[in-house]
């Protein structure tokens, strides 16, 4: 049975005999971040039973994690490159505070968590170069982010574990939606 790169296998990028286009570079970059998320999810799932928990909805209500919807212009029906790109960049900027929260949540994968955070910053820069409509991109308020971070860190252990699991799962899905949408651009 085929085993593709995924939650349980490592991808090795194929060698290139020619330079990548900016779109291909972004594609590979997102794949690299997804590898990192995959590793972090492994540690989270091994450490707790959050990945099988049915109580996700309880914790999810307290989080406002970016999610792709049809109105964002990233789906095939009603696809709009500018609207979609704004949604992707805005969403990534909103995820930054959650990625900051993850920084102290891992023991054996501390470097991996840092790599995911730094690679996301680089991805945002790549995409900002691609975006024409930069005025429409709203950057989260630093004070709002700071108070959200404090609030998340003040949760009990179970909620912190659940929050970690939900951030990783949502970020993975958001990046997968991005990957698919960016291939249309």
């Amino acid at each position: 049975a085929p085993v593709l790169p995924g939650e349980d296998s490592k991808n090795v990028a194929a060698p290139h005999s020619q330079p990548l286009t900016s779109s291909e570079r972004i594609d590979k970059h997102i794949r690299y971040i997804l590898d990192g998320i995959s590793a972090l999810r492994k540690e989270t799932c091994n450490r707790s039973n959050m990945c099988e928990s049915s109580k996700e909805a309880l914790a999810e209500n307290n989080l406002n994690l970016p999610k792709m919807a049809e109105k964002d212009g990233c789906f095939q029906s009603g696809f709009n490159e500018d609207t979609c790109l704004v949604k992707i960049i805005t969403g990534l900027l909103e995820f930054e505070v959650y990625l900051e929260y993850l920084q102290n949540r891992f023991e054996s994968s501390e470097e991996q968590a840092r790599a995911v955070q730094m690679s996301t910053k680089v991805l945002i820069q790549f995409l900002q170069k691609k975006a024409k409509n930069l005025d429409a991109i709203t950057t989260p308020e630093p004070t709002t982010n700071a108070s959200l971070l404090t609030k998340l860190q003040a949760q009990n252990q179970w909620l912190q574990d659940m929050t970690t699991h939900l951030i990783l799962r949502s970020f993975k899905e958001f990046l997968q939606s991005n990957l698919r949408a960016l291939r249309q651009m």
Epitope: A1, P2, L4, P5, N11, F75, S77, K172, E173, Q176
Partner: antibody, heavy 122, light 107 residues
Framework: QVTLKESGPVLVKPTETLTLTCTVS??????????VGWIRQPPGKALEWLAH???????RYNSALKSRLTISKDTSKSQVVLTMTNMDPVDTATYYC??????????????WGQGTLVTVSS | DIQMTQSPSSLSASVGDRVTITCRAS??????LHWYQQKPGKAPKLLIY???QSISGVPSRFSGSGSGTDFTLTISSLQPEDFATYYC?????????FGQGTKVEIK
């Protein structure tokens, strides 16, 4: 293990609508990054991608056939349905459903059903 | 649409032979090229993905190479079970397109 199974009529008349169902097991249609697609192969000819549907209900169609195709899914039943209107004898083919995607939302098919031969004839 | 052209369309070879199949894309698809094997009356089976990545369970005699527009599938030492039709697929952009197939027959 991952399996996909196609079901539907073996014979349809010209101008009729074909409805094919793909029932999957071993993975969930709601797992992010995943999708299910339909590919057909006329006897003795090459493969032709028709359509697919992603985990979040985003859909893709072969532009040459788009006006005739509709793809949908029922996650609770683990089923993906393809309908193709105004069937013609040239649509006679083996119709396959296949799993697509994965962590990188790969544009490839890693598991296939065994296929169902659909003949269009009056 | 990106056209995928395979050559040859068929070939005859003996067990133990080294077999090379080529696939050309009408425009650059980077390494987003996948290979499938299909035996008569059976569904296709994924053989190689992203031009050169091997699939777990696929014998090591199968290898792929190439990037951009020109790709190659190589069977280093043909075995009796390798007699089949091989297809390349554009996995770069929509619509996904396949080559017309290369039938590998017994000499």
């Amino acid at each position: 293990q991952v399996t996909l199974k196609e079901s539907g009529p073996v014979l349809v008349k010209p101008t009729e609508t074909l409805t094919l169902t793909c029932t999957v097991s071993g993975f969930s249609l709601s797992t992010s990054g995943m999708g299910v697609g339909w590919i057909r192969q006329p006897p003795g000819k090459a493969l032709e991608w028709l359509a697919h549907i992603w985990w979040d209900d985003d859909k893709r169609y072969n532009s040459a056939l788009k006006s005739r195709l509709t793809i949908s899914k029922d996650t609770s039943k683990s089923q993906v349905v393809l309908t193709m209107t105004n069937m013609d004898p040239v649509d006679t083919a083996t119709y396959y459903c296949a799993r697509i995607g994965g962590l990188y939302v790969d544009y490839l098919m890693d598991y296939w059903g065994q296929g169902t031969l659909v003949t269009v004839s009056s | 649409d990106i056209q995928m052209t395979q050559s040859p369309s068929s070939l005859s070879a003996s067990v133990g032979d080294r077999v090379t199949i080529t696939c050309r894309a009408s425009q650059s698809i980077s390494d987003y090229l996948h290979w499938y094997q299909q035996k008569p009356g059976k569904a296709p089976k994924l053989l190689i993905y992203y031009a050169s990545q091997s699939i777990s369970g696929v014998p090591s005699r199968f290898s792929g190479s190439g990037s951009g527009t020109d790709f190659t599938l190589t069977i280093s030492s043909l075995q009796p079970e390798d007699f089949a039709t091989y297809y390349c697929q554009n996995g770069h952009s929509f619509p996904w397109t396949f080559g017309q197939g290369t039938k590998v027959e017994i000499k």
